[in-house]
């Protein structure tokens, strides 16, 4: 019996087609992805093959203005239109709190939404009961297929699930649900979830009875043969894991942003054992036409987005200096504003010992592309912020050793004075540079804001300590020459859309007045500073 699994993950609000790098589509003839194009391909496969499942491994939420405006209603509407068979909850599905998941998505989705390792407690338990499930048994042709869901147990640190959801260890939670499916004589089981490729592989290895793992969160691109676009494969598709009980378990993921449609064919024997598995992600490029009816619906929904872009989010009473002359040479108040917004967006009081789990932010000055003038009645709009942050990136959470951070700050000023983009703006960090010293030895003081404290204060950076830092995904991926971040990071979780983070902060604050306040100091002559 042959099953075709079509899968997406980490689509992040890319409802419209995008450019090759998943940013805004500029030249339509070279654009990719989008739900209209995805639907064309899905329908083509559904017509050609008998037993097809369309699955999503989470993080549909968050990423473009579509989510900012429609808050998940767009996800439910278009996933319903594409007739998804099931979805696993990702961490970003909790970005607007539990209510922001229940009302727009859980109550509106015409497909089951799954997670076995999220347990509701207290008053939420009855409110959310039945709206998401640990598993679902789906009939496909003459057979049934069990799908068990899972979600990153780091979600409380990455999003806003509140205090009434408990995120259990994935493997511990999945095993009893798979066992239940076995007692229902369901012998073909897919684990569908959102915990990243490393956990996907562990699930394949450790959870008895799982036949296939369809994952997300780590935006992993797998491919067999010559890859069709810019993404470099992390391994073959499918990636085969040998389970502890000796089975070959295919593990798949389909990069992100709706650029590819994962396509996996599995052959099962009559006892539900996987005999063979093969496939590849399908690049959704312009050779695949956009479905006209879905496209028309997208265009109808788009109208509200254009109106939103020009509405006032809040006011500034000071000039927001986002000029390259400032932000690539010294502390600029636009950099401070953005970093403050980034920390504010990551306030998660999950432990009494910590005022917050993260206090530090770094931001490449070259990523700040425009100032905002206060003399326009102080008005700040989404359109203004899109000029400041035009790349459609995310502000991510990483864990780094102090030594890596020190290298990053050395890199920040290694060729100071040439208006290069790597000059770092900061939050929760005080840095002093001596630019008269040779490159690679210019950081003379680096103090960081404590987290395990009731009164936050600055302490010298410790080289061997592991720190959490919020930064643009561009830096996490080694952009602007920050290779040491990419190479040495201990953990990387993708965060919220950059503009959305700043716009939410401005809306919350109503009136802003960021200052230049001595976070970054530099001098060109020897001072008697102690090395740290």
């Amino acid at each position: 019996w042959e099953l075709t699994i079509l899968h997406t993950n980490d689509v992040h609000s890319r409802l419209e087609q995008t450019s090759e790098d998943s940013s805004k589509c500029v030249n339509a003839s070279r654009c990719m992805g989008g739900v209209a194009r995805l639907f064309t391909k899905v329908q083509q496969i559904r017509r050609a093959e008998p037993n097809v499942l369309l699955l999503d491994a989470g993080d549909q939420y968050q990423g473009t203005i579509w989510f900012t405006v429609y808050k998940g209603a767009e996800v439910a509407h278009f996933m319903n239109a594409l007739r998804y068979d099931a979805m696993a909850l990702g961490n970003h599905e909790f970005d607007n709190g539990v209510e922001g998941l229940i009302e727009p998505l859980l109550k509106e989705a015409k497909f089951p939404i799954l997670s076995a390792n999220i347990k509701a407690k207290g008053p939420l338990a009855s409110q959310i009961s039945g709206l998401y499930l640990p598993y679902k048994v789906l009939p496909v042709g003459d057979e049934v297929v069990g799908i068990v869901g899972y979600t990153s147990k780091e979600t409380p640190f990455l999003s806003n699930p509140g205090t009434n959801l408990v995120f259990e260890d994935e493997i511990t939670a999945l095993q009893p649900e798979v066992d239940k499916l076995k007692t229902l004589n369901v012998n073909k089981i897919i684990a569908l979830g959102h915990s990243g490729f490393e956990m996907d592989k562990l699930i394949a290895q450790k959870v008895r009875g799982v036949d296939v793992v369809v994952g997300g969160h780590s935006n992993t691109f797998l491919y067999t043969g010559n890859p069709p676009s810019k993404e470099v494969p992390a391994g073959k598709y499918p990636f085969i894991v040998t389970s502890d009980d000796g089975r070959k378990v295919p593990v798949v993921q389909a990069y992100a942003f709706g650029k590819y449609l994962g396509y996996l064919k599995i052959e099962f024997d009559e006892r539900g054992n996987v005999i063979s598995s093969h496939g590849n992600p399908i690049l959704l490029n312009s050779s695949i036409p956009e479905d006209p009816s879905i496209k028309a619906d997208i265009n109808k929904w788009r109208i509200k987005l254009d109106n939103y872009s020009t509405q006032e989010l809040g006011k500034t009473i000071v000039y927001l200096d986002g000029s390259s002359q400032s932000c690539r040479f010294r502390e600029c108040n636009m950099g401070n504003l953005i970093c403050d917004a980034m920390i504010n967006n990551n306030l998660r009081h999950t432990d009494e010992m910590f005022w917050n789990h993260v206090s530090m932010c770094i931001l490449n000055g070259g990523g700040i592309r425009s100032p905002i003038d206060e003399r326009n009645n102080g008005t700040i709009t989404w359109e203004n912020l899109a000029a400041v942050l035009p790349f459609g990136g995310t502000f991510d959470l990483v864990q780094l050793k102090g030594s890596t951070l020190k290298k990053a700050f050395e890199h920040s000023v290694h060729r100071y004075g040439q208006s290069t983009g790597e000059f770092l703006q900061v939050g929760g960090i005080h840095v002093v540079y001596d630019l008269s010293r040779k490159p690679g030895d210019r950081v003379v003081k680096l103090d960081v804001l404590c987290t395990k404290c009731r009164v936050p204060s600055y302490d010298p950076l410790k080289m061997d300590e592991v720190y959490k830092v919020i930064l643009p995904n561009f830096l996490a991926n080694g952009g602007d020459g920050f290779q040491m971040i990419k190479d040495e990071l201990l953990r990387h979780d993708s965060g919220d859309q950059d503009i959305n983070v700043v716009s939410t902060y401005i809306s919350k604050m109503k009136v802003i007045y960021p200052a230049v306040e001595g976070r970054i100091k530099a001098h060109h002559h020897h001072h008697h500073h102690h090395h740290h």
Epitope: K110, V137, L138, T183, L184, N185
Partner: antibody, heavy 118, light 107 residues
């Protein structure tokens, strides 16, 4: 709350057909199976078949195959069971039921009595 | 098809009694057994599924046990509203099948 409301009692002649409806509310229709169950007067329960409205997959008990057709109208959140070439042994109460996660029948309609009599 | 044989087919008991109904499957059904209660002229009501999991709102006096081929429904202390017909069902494989019923009457 979850509700399944069935159409009213029917009296039919042998050889005729009957179509029983099951209108659902209080939940997402596409996300749960609808099962049909037969109960002859004073007798036990027999599973006729299912429909999964999400992908309109239908499975019949071999015993009922050929004369039973199960359908669903997603827009009306309603399932239907049609029984053709009626005979006297089809006289029974027909129930629709919903799962709460596959294979057991958590919520039931009130039943529809179909009487086949010449 | 899997046959489910219930016993007894009827039994008389008094309020406060402990009552046990058994169900034997013609082949191994693991723990995939449900129990229903039906009163005259009414639809069946789910009591227990997966052998021993009580459905929402079902009183704790109802319990289930067993695995493989032998399964049991126990009512620990009969209440007046418990007099009804009880059916077991295997939810292990299609076609899903029911026992022939056990009618519980007042002694």
């Amino acid at each position: 709350q979850v509700q399944l409301v069935q159409s009213g009692a029917e009296v039919k002649k042998p050889g005729a057909s009957v179509k029983v409806s099951c209108k659902t509310s209080g939940y997402t229709f596409t996300n749960y199976y609808i099962y049909w169950v037969k109960q002859r007067p004073g007798q036990g329960l027999e599973w006729i078949g299912w429909i999964y409205p999400g992908n309109l997959n239908i499975k019949y008990n071999e015993k009922f195959k050929g004369r039973v057709t199960i359908t669903a109208d997603k827009s009306a959140s309603t399932a239907y069971m049609e029984l053709s070439s009626l005979r006297s042994e089809d006289t029974a109460v027909y129930y629709c039921a919903r799962d709460d996660n596959y294979a057991w029948f958590a919520y039931w309609g009130q039943g529809t009595l179909v009487t086949v009599s010449s | 098809d899997i046959q489910m044989t219930q016993s007894p087919s009827s039994l008389s008991a008094s309020v406060g009694d402990r009552v046990t109904i058994t169900c034997k499957a013609s082949q191994d059904v693991s723990t995939a057994v449900a129990w229903y209660q039906q009163k005259p002229g009414k639809s069946p009501k789910l009591l227990i599924y997966w052998t021993n999991t009580r459905h929402t709102g079902v009183p704790s006096r109802f319990s289930g046990s067993g695995s493989g081929t032998d399964h049991t429904l126990t009512i620990s202390s009969l209440q007046p509203e418990d007099f009804a017909t009880y059916y077991c069902q295997q939810h292990y494989s299609t076609p899903f099948t029911f026992g022939q019923g056990t009618k519980l009457e007042i002694k």
